[in-house]
């Protein structure tokens, strides 16, 4: 819809703006469900969503300090099929555990080149970045 | 680790940088599974992930032109319980269909105030924004 220019902070930049950015409280984006204990193929009866799911998953960190957000988390399925709702452990071959993907907007820090080719701070470059969000229990596709 | 300042483009900014930002191919973030036909509580045997899931969901658009990304999508569960893997339609009370939430990093366009209080383009303000990503079939919590 609208065009957002990239931008390089210049030396004469108001310091209050610099502060305003860096003091926004952005904790590392560790999802509540970032739980590395649930690494087995079973659906728990307590704990975070990713361990109670019948398509359980764990999270893996993707960190790049030249990117915003710097920390992203990718889901990794712990089972090929869904876990039985009855037992919470045995797999049900009638259901597949599939990754749900999303193209997330991220911003990369890139050197800015002034008119004479010299570096002028950095520019932000917008990109789409593929992230796996969760594992979902689905009915297998029936080919027509 | 690092501080990323907010930034306001100034008038004397190289036009090629402005172009570089606006020409990055960022299509509207319509997930492959953005399908408003599957608004009933059933798990399909074809179609996108959100309609084949036994915890099916639909997407609702959240658009703000002063935010990056401008378009976000919120999942909305179509069933309170999970759909049976066997029939794809009857609900199984042993499983709950629960929303998976994520605090996504977004950027808001804000007026920039120069040293004399005058507007100088805009600044980007980083914030966490709660988005529902999907519906997940989970085993209900067992209270200890």
């Amino acid at each position: 819809y609208s065009h957002w220019p990239s931008c390089c902070p210049s030396k004469g930049y108001p310091s209050e703006e610099l502060l305003r950015w860096s003091t926004v409280p952005v904790p590392p984006l560790k999802p509540a469900s970032l739980d590395f204990h649930s690494v087995s193929c079973r659906a728990s009866e307590d704990g975070p969503l990713n361990s109670r799911a019948i398509s359980p998953w764990r999270y893996e960190l993707d960190r790049d300090l030249n990117r915003l957000p710097q920390d992203l988390y990718h889901a990794r399925c712990l089972c090929p099929h869904c876990v039985s709702l009855q037992t919470g452990s045995h797999m049900d071959p009638r259901g597949n555990s599939e990754l749900l993907y999303h193209n997330q907007t991220v911003f990369y820090r890139r050197p800015c080149h002034g008119k004479k080719g010299n570096h002028k701070g950095y520019c932000l470059e917008r990109r789409l970045y593929r992230v796996s969000l969760a594992c979902v229990c689905v009915r297998p596709r029936v080919m027509g | 680790y690092s501080h990323w300042p907010s930034c306001c483009p100034s008038k004397g900014y190289p036009s090629e940088e402005l172009l570089r930002w606006s020409t990055v191919p960022v299509p509207p973030l319509k997930p492959a599974s953005l399908d408003f036909h599957s608004v009933s509580c059933r798990a399909s045997e074809d179609g996108p992930l959100n309609s084949r899931a036994i915890s099916p969901w639909r997407y609702e658009l959240d658009r703000d032109l002063n935010r990056l990304p401008q378009d976000l999508y919120h999942a909305r569960c179509l069933c309170p319980h999970c759909v049976s893997l066997q029939t794809g339609s009857h609900m199984d009370p042993r499983g709950n269909s629960e929303l998976l939430y994520h605090n996504q990093t977004v950027f808001y366009r804000r007026p920039c105030h120069g040293k004399k209080g005058n507007h100088k383009g805009y600044c980007l303000e980083r914030r966490l924004y709660r988005v529902s990503l999907a519906c997940v079939c989970v085993r209900p919590r067992v209270m200890g």
Partner: antibody, heavy 123, light 108 residues
Amino acid sequence: QVQLKESGPGLVAPSQSLSITCTVSGFSLTDYGINWVRQPPGKGLEWLGMIWGDGVTHYNSVLKSRLSISKDNSMSQIFLKMNSLQTDDTARYYCARTLFYDGTLYYYAMDYWGQGTSVTVSS
Amino acid sequence: QIVLTQSPATMSASPGEKVTMTCSASSSVTYMYWYQQKTGSSPRLLIYDTPNLASGVPVRFSGSGSGTSYSLTISRVEAEDAATYYCQQWSSYPHTWTFGGGTKLEIK
């Protein structure tokens, strides 16, 4: 100036575990990452794992189940622990500082290395 | 996981000659680095995020390339350049540092 120094046991018996300490000076462990790299005799470099300034760790996927990296910021020390050693783990083990900032970008190069510590796995 | 292949495995050159060695990646790489390792010494960073020269590295060294193809060039080889040269890439996910197999440079 920036310095890193590894200290290890030298000789380890097969199936036993290995512990190596990397002691650093000239910079703070909260501001940099530390990588562990090994080099078998006459062979190339192999990345083992890394610990960020905030303590987050990453491991070589092949060796993940056998490795553990931790640190003590106040003592300026990083620890590598490796379990179930075999003869093909015989190598020189290096720690290397990672992540430097040039005012524009962060770089993931290993800009300072220790002299390495030689580890022989033998009975 | 990305695999880096360096070629040639071994090469020799006379002082004053121009030397180029290559590093080929199995898929596109964002961050590429080059190291020099002399016999009995630790590796030393030469080039970071191609084509930047690390501190104290002579200007006869240069790095170029993008995507899957990178190269290290020494414009006029000197006797002290006898060493093994490694390329290395970093990726944020899966989080790995990968080294190439190395190119050994011998000076005639």
